[in-house]
């Protein structure tokens, strides 16, 4: 037991306040914004991270406005309601009483309505497609090396079980990472694919959520993999319910 161990911080979430006042001097960390206790041995849920992000000083906030692709998160940041486990509540509302239903990754899956809108259950996002374009390199990356490196990244950095990384596709300069995780497959203690994808997204943008760790330094056989754009597509176990007006827009 050395002095180096006596630092009460949350290695997996820098958006926390920690103090060693738990039972027996255990380090206990609470997420900013919600004040909820977080488990620092694993990833913090995306809902609590978004809430913490919204509680940060305004000048530190960078609004994310992804491009207008049908299945991506076009709504950007909002201050979500999280349940006692830190998951998104199925119904989200803003300060002007506009409400909508979200999936398990917090992405809107219905038209916006008023306070009478009902969202019966939190629909699980079971398939996430992360679409990356890398910066030009001297030559294409070796597909199997790239595949191995990305799988290693999700296993080691995000602690996502390898079975949930369904595939890695590559057609220079596009890389696609498929994450799949059905409700029945997710055991207690398993990292959620939505949380892993969010940590990856923030890493790629140079906004790492990890405490004191360097930013993401992705290399394939020593060659830096620099991403110049990211799109994330979410597929739910139950299809979303948008009006025809939106679908034809």
């Amino acid at each position: 037991h050395t002095a180096a161990q006596d630092n009460c911080t949350c290695p997996t979430n820098k958006m926390t306040v920690c103090s060693p006042d738990g039972p027996g001097g255990r380090c206990q960390c609470r997420a900013l914004g919600s004040g909820m206790a977080v488990d620092c041995s694993t990833l913090t849920s995306k809902c609590l991270l978004l809430k913490a992000r919204m509680s940060a000083p305004k000048n530190a906030r960078t609004l994310v406005r992804p491009s207008e692709h049908a299945l991506v998160d076009n709504d950007g940041l909002y201050d979500p309601d999280c349940d006692p486990e830190g998951r998104f509540k199925a119904r989200q509302c803003n300060q002007t009483s506009v409400c909508w239903c979200v999936n398990s990754v917090g992405v809107r899956r219905t038209d916006k309505g008023d306070l009478s809108l009902r969202c019966d259950e939190l629909v699980r996002t079971h398939h996430i497609l992360i679409d990356l374009r890398h910066r030009p390199t001297a030559g294409a990356f070796n597909h199997s090396d790239l595949d191995a490196e990305l799988r290693r990244l999700f296993r080691e950095r995000y602690r996502l079980h390898p079975k949930f990384v369904a595939a890695v596709h590559y057609e220079q300069p596009t890389i696609q990472i498929e994450l799949r995780q059905n409700t029945s497959q997710k055991a207690a203690g398993d990292v959620d694919i939505g949380d892993a994808a969010y940590y990856f997204e923030r890493d790629i943008k140079g906004e790492s959520l990890f405490q004191g760790r360097g930013g993401l330094d992705l290399r394939v056989r020593g060659e830096p993999l620099q991403v110049e754009r990211t799109l994330i597509y979410y597929l739910d176990e139950i299809p979303p319910k948008f009006s025809m007006k939106r679908l034809t827009a």
Partner: antibody, heavy 116, light 107 residues
């Protein structure tokens, strides 16, 4: 190095109160919790409570609520425990301990004898 | 409150013998378990924390193991200075609770 120096033995009358001290040195007092533990002769260890000088937050064993009061003086790096309405059941050695993640540095103990 | 049941309550062992003391929690305690040694007239001494982490300066003959509700302290080769009373402590939740103790004596 970390040291916890506890006050000397006390002989007190039934019904009286006693306040013992635990002076910390070798570390930043406000960074760690102080726990108090009771050991009666021939019996086991019993947890009394915990105080965190960093925020003056505390937790008590329900068996000691009303019996023990924990305080901390940041200016002198000293934790205190006051025991009220003493009976023969309170005759024991009381230890203070600095805890972090279940690892503890212990004081040498304060012997309290309740005797008419 | 979490009840810690420690066994045996007392035991005799030879020098050089392998000794194991167990602690069972009334519910899972997520490895938040410490072991202490207490000798007459002395302060308790921390041996193990987080179920299996050895405190600096404690001889490597001491080791801790277990998970869930069941934990153990093992002394691989008993030394004369290991005589005393051993206690487990759970710090998974308040109130902290100790086991009843195991008195270890020389055979």
């Amino acid at each position: 190095q970390v040291q916890l120096q506890q006050s000397g033995p006390e002989v007190v009358k039934p019904g009286a109160s006693v306040k013992m001290s635990c002076r910390a040195s070798g570390y930043r007092f406000t960074d760690y919790v102080i726990n108090w533990v009771k050991q009666r002769t021939g019996q086991g260890l019993e947890w009394i409570g915990q105080i965190y000088p960093g925020s003056d937050s505390f937790h008590y064993n329900k068996n000691f609520k009303g019996k023990a009061t924990l305080t901390a003086d940041k200016s002198s790096n000293t934790a205190y425990m006051q025991l009220n309405s003493l009976t023969s059941e309170d005759s024991a050695v009381y230890f203070c301990a600095r805890f972090f993640e279940g690892f503890a540095y212990w004081g040498q103990g304060t012997l309290v004898t309740v005797s008419a | 409150d979490i009840k810690m049941t420690q066994s045996p309550s007392s035991m005799y062992a030879f020098l050089g013998e392998r000794v194991t003391i167990t602690c069972k929690a009334s519910q899972g305690i997520n490895n938040y378990l410490s072991w202490f040694q207490l000798k007459p007239g002395k302060s308790p001494k921390s041996l193990i924390y987080r179920a299996n982490r050895l405190v600096d300066g404690v001889p490597s003959r001491f080791s801790g193991s277990g998970s869930g509700q069941d934990y153990s302290l093992t002394i691989s080769s008993l030394d004369y200075e290991d005589m005393g009373i051993y206690y487990c402590l759970q710090y998974d939740e308040f109130p902290l609770t100790f086991g009843g103790g195991t008195k270890l004596e020389l055979k």
